[in-house]
Interface confidence: low
């Protein structure tokens, strides 16, 4: 808000107006208007010669504004010369500006028909178990005036959850300075916000408009099970669709999948509604929507609708999700060479083929840089010539490999190490 | 909106669940939940042994998730081992998750009490001189159904100027698919926006809630004098204050200062309201507010209020706003030296002292770098020794300088130039 007292100089023409005289024959005035204002209204410089005589001053467009700066980017400077025969030390000139046509508007206000009662103040919330009491006060002027009495007023309380819009807020009317909100008004475990305004009671002799809204007040509703879906609402479009929506905490929705189930009559079979559409609702909740078809509203006029966890199942076929136990691995020395031998845990089904992956490396290498061999149904592997006096490591893993069977590699066997022998010098 | 078909796997436990068996003695499952979900609900892995038998699976916390990635930053991995004696190629396991307590909500929907009629479509505006016709359509399903008839419905049209809020919008009710807005509804030269919703008529057998709002439609109202102040409104607080507000185009307010004037009865004298508070209203308008005192609402129940241009005046005292005419300047040569002489326009009042400012410079210098002298009541000045064979320039200006008189410097005199003589060589 900007404040201006009556009489404050605020227009650009008046701000920029400067008048200087030569104290002999004339007064020169300079001022500016804006291009934007000129599109809508032209103003004329007026000199008040005496109490009754206002004289328009003839002004020309000017190229410059040497005496004052213009506070607007698109100023139109003007210069005016007023002939003047006599100058006295007490002379004062009175200048103003006048629009080129009458501007203004007028209203006759009958007080009883133009009432805006005072807005509620000191809105507070207090609680008693799961009931919440909103209280406020309203200043009605001095009690002796009696012009506006409590009987002329009622109060409109609107309240909503923090994440909802005021447009969808619930309304409660009260003819006292308080209102109670109980479990029937509030969803559990939610943050609510309320505001109140004063309005004229229907039976009052007064008319006008409601007060401004009071400042808002916030509170947490009665505690409840936050994992429960809430705010299930269904509305029929009058033709063929019953549109339902409900809300779930985002964290809960990540672990429990809820579906909408319906029956067109108590003894009908339950069906699941699909597709479900989802949208975010604030940072904590997700709102779900689904449309239930209503083929015959005249016959089936009552639907039983519920939100329940869906038995969303994952089907896992045993024969293609096999992970065998890791083989047990041994290293043997046959003359000058080395062999790897392994055993798998006995499987009840001997017709299932096995694929083995064998890795071996020097102690100084990593498994990533190891040699890798793949063998089918074998249980041993002769190693090629190895470097003498070197420590080696080996490991093996297994997977099923018969058509109709599948899975993932077993864990690696426990890694085995051995040291190759040194070579005797040739002399 | 996100769309999910009934049956879509969407929860983190189901997404992350992987089960592998050794095809001999056991199945190992791994899955994850989130810490955030666990605060509100715990889920248990369920194995469906047959159509009727659901068995909970015992799972332990795990350090890792080798078989799948968790799509959440705070996952809690789990590992479960299910003993299993026989495996057949056709075996399929059915896994799901179940919350630790019954979750859900239920609603019995009587269609006649849960109606949300369809929202209006094709909202259009057409004009006939200064009247504007809003038309729309509404789809009521097949005519043969007759469940929802036009007689069950009415339409709520809300309209406002672009810069106003929907909360302060005006409402018009219509029981047909059209509404007319005339000059009595609309301010001239304004952009308006309207929207419509369908609601259940008071006499209908149906109940529920209004439709969603239609998309908005915009139009420009009948042209008018945009320089006029508009929307003058006054409301009495029922105690002692009549609060008035009005709007002015920003460009007009920059050139014309409006005031609020009031009379507590037709034959009372007019007074001006002060202070006026201002606030921006959109990009084009300024809203002004002022509070009129109402000392006796019982006696004076009707106020005449008007917005008019204020005679905001600037008072300019002649004797302290003097700008004399510039002096006329000449240069004279007295032997080897030069003098400047000037005259001022004859003033009718000889008792007023004059101060002169004299500047002179070489042709190659600028006025900023010139020599400056100030003299009181003098009309000439001898110049000091100048450089030979050089062009010089001089100028002079004047201002009044007697107590009780003031003003600004005159314009500079016309600048005069002269060339100094060359010096004869000494031989």
């Amino acid at each position: 808000w900007e404040r201006s007292l009556a009489g404050a100089e605020e227009t650009i023409p008046l701000q920029t107006l400067r008048c200087y005289n030569d104290y002999t024959s004339h007064i020169t005035c300079r001022w500016a208007d804006t291009q934007d204002a000129q599109r809508l209204v032209n103003v004329t410089l007026i000199r008040r010669v005496n109490e009754d005589l206002l004289e328009p001053v003839s002004c020309d467009l000017s190229d410059d504004m040497p005496w004052s700066a213009c506070p607007h980017p698109r100023c139109v400077p003007r210069r005016c010369v007023i002939p003047c025969q006599s100058f006295v030390v007490t002379d004062v000139d009175y200048f103003s500006f006048q629009p080129d046509r009458p501007l203004g508007t007028r209203l006759t206000v009958t007080l009883t028909q133009h009432v805006q009662p005072p807005e509620p103040r000191d809105l507070q919330i207090s609680t008693d178990q799961d009931h919440f009491l909103l209280t406020w006060s309203v200043a009605l002027g001095s009690p002796q005036s009696h012009w506006l009495s409590p009987g002329d007023l009622e109060f409109e309380v609107v309240y909503k959850r923090l994440q909802d819009s005021w447009e969808d807020a619930a309304i409660l009317l009260s003819n006292t300075s308080q209102a109670t909100l109980g479990p029937e008004h509030l969803m559990p475990s939610s943050t609510y916000v309320a505001r109140v305004r004063t309005r004229l009671a229907p039976g009052s002799r007064l008319s006008g408009r409601p007060s401004k809204w009071s400042p808002e007040v916030c509170w947490d509703s009665q505690p409840g099970d936050e994992a429960q879906p809430q705010n299930l609402e269904c509305f029929f479009d009058g033709a063929a669709v019953l549109s339902c929506s409900w809300e779930v905490r985002k964290e809960v929705a990540s672990s429990v999948s809820f579906g909408l189930f319906y029956k067109p009559s108590p003894d009908a079979g339950e069906e699941e509604c699909s597709p479900v559409l989802r949208e975010g609702l604030g940072s904590l909740h997700t709102r779900h929507h689904c449309q239930i078809p209503v083929p015959d509203p005249a016959t089936h006029g009552q639907y039983i609708v519920s939100v329940q966890p869906r038995r969303a199942e994952k089907h896992i076929k045993s024969s293609v999700n096999i992970q065998m136990a890791p083989p047990s691995l041994n290293v043997t020395k046959d003359g000058d060479s080395y062999s790897l031998r392994w055993e798998t845990m006995k499987m009840r089904y001997e017709h299932i083929d096995h694929t083995f992956e064998i890795q071996y490396r020097k102690d100084t290498a990593t498994w990533k840089d190891s040699k890798t061999e793949t063998l089918q149904n074998a249980h041993s592997m002769a190693l090629p010539a190895l470097e003498p006096s070197t420590r080696y490591w080996a490991r093996v893993r297994v997977r099923t490999s018969r058509t109709g069977y599948n899975g993932i590699w077993s864990e690696w066997s426990e890694a085995r190490s051995w040291d190759t022998e040194s070579v005797l010098p040739m002399w | 909106w996100e769309r999910s078909l009934a049956g879509a796997e969407e929860t983190i436990p189901l997404q992350t669940l992987r089960c592998y068996n050794d095809y001999t003695s056991h199945i190992t499952c791994r899955w994850a939940d989130t810490q955030d979900a666990q605060r509100l609900v715990n889920v248990t892995l369920i194995r469906r042994v047959n159509e009727d038998l659901l068995e909970p699976v015992s799972c332990d916390l795990s350090d890792d998730m080798p078989w799948s990635a968790c799509p959440h930053p705070r996952c809690v991995p789990r590992r479960c081992v299910i003993p299993c004696q026989s495996f057949v190629v056709t075996d399929v396991d059915y896994f799901s998750f179940q919350p630790d307590r019954p979750l859900g909500t239920r609603l019995t929907v009587t269609l006649t009490q849960h109606v949300q009629p369809p929202e209006p479509r094709d909202l259009q505006i057409s004009t006939d001189q200064d009247h504007f016709l809003l038309t729309w359509s509404v789809a009521l399903g097949s005519p043969q159904s007759h469940w929802l008839s036009p007689g069950d419905l009415e339409f709520e049209v809300v309209y406002k100027r672009l810069q106003d809020s929907w909360e302060d919008a005006a409402i018009l009710l219509s029981n047909t698919s059209q509404a007319t807005l005339g000059p009595e509804h609309l301010m001239p030269s304004s952009t308006y926006v309207a929207r419509v919703r369908t609601r259940l008529a008071p006499g209908s057998r149906l109940s529920g809630r209004p439709s969603k709002w239609s998309p908005e439609v915009c139009w420009d109202s009948q042209p008018g004098d945009e320089a006029q102040p508009q929307n003058l409104e006054c409301f009495f607080d029922g105690a002692a204050v009549l609060s008035c507000s009005w709007e002015v185009r920003k460009e007009v307010a920059s050139s014309v200062s409006f005031g609020l004037f009031y009379k507590p009865s037709p034959d009372a004298g007019e007074e001006e309201c002060s202070p006026v508070l201002r606030e921006g209203l959109g990009s084009l308008h300024t809203r002004h507010h002022c509070q009129i005192p109402v000392p006796d609402p019982a006696t004076h129940g009707q106020y005449i209020v008007s917005v008019q241009p204020r005679r905001a005046e600037k008072h300019i005292k002649s004797s302290v706003n003097i700008q004399m005419a510039p002096p006329s300047l000449n240069v004279t040569k007295d032997g080897d030296s030069y003098s400047l002489r000037w005259e001022t326009m004859k003033m009718r009042y000889e008792h007023i002292d004059h101060t002169f400012e004299i500047q002179y410079r070489k042709d190659t210098a600028t006025w900023k770098d010139s020599k400056t002298e100030t003299l009181q009541n003098a009309h000439s000045m001898a110049l000091p020794a100048l450089e030979p064979s050089t062009r010089y320039w001089a100028r002079v200006r004047v201002r009044t300088s007697r107590t009780g008189y003031n003003g600004i410097w005159s314009e500079w005199s016309e600048a005069r130039s002269w060339d100094t003589e060359s010096v004869l060589p000494m031989w």
């Epitope: 919330i125 178990q129 947490d220 505690p223 | 605060r39």
Partner: antibody, heavy 118, light 105 residues
Framework: QVQLVESGGGLVKPGGSLRLSCAAS????????MNWIRQAPGKGLEWVSY????????YYADSVKGRFTISRDNAKNSLYLQMNSLRAEDTAVYYC???????????WGQGTTVTVSS | EIVLTQSPGTLSLSPGERATLSCRAS???????LAWYQQKPGQAPRLLIY???SRATGIPDRFSGSGSGTDFTLTISRLEPEDFAVYYC??????FGQGTKVEIK
Amino acid sequence: QVQLVESGGGLVKPGGSLRLSCAASGFTFSDYYMNWIRQAPGKGLEWVSYISTSGSIIYYADSVKGRFTISRDNAKNSLYLQMNSLRAEDTAVYYCARRRYYYGMDVWGQGTTVTVSS
Amino acid sequence: EIVLTQSPGTLSLSPGERATLSCRASQSVSSSYLAWYQQKPGQAPRLLIYGASSRATGIPDRFSGSGSGTDFTLTISRLEPEDFAVYYCQQYGRTFGQGTKVEIK
């Protein structure tokens, strides 16, 4: 592990003041409603005061209304009880306890002793 | 204000016996908001039952709660030596009953 630890108790003269603190650890403090409960020597439990998760709702037992003030600082995981105008009958062990919806007060502190005596 | 009255004031029983403790409210209480606590000398109370009938984490299944409206019951099916203590009922997370002491006969 989940823990509540009270501090600030002691001996005070009638009419004096004390400020009790309760430090929470091992759980998300801002998710829980917090309570103060007291137990006079040889007597039963008496609920004193309660504060909601965000601190927007507070209430007190009639016996302490106007004298005691409960507050919380979720950033510091702390609960407080400012006790003014203390009387002899305020002598008790003061416990802080957390409550989550209708699940009851499932975690309690070990208590701090307040003795009001001249 | 709702007043909770517990009976009996003291219950003298032997280990292995069944204990039945009563809690009566002066007006109807939502069963969702009724809880039972156990307190041993020199210790803080311990939550046993919430929502009138749900066992708190780690509470043995010999403890069970029932009731609705104004009458609620805590039952200990077979008393163990460690069960001898004082038991309190509480409503709406606020008022406590005066307590029932279960002592060894």
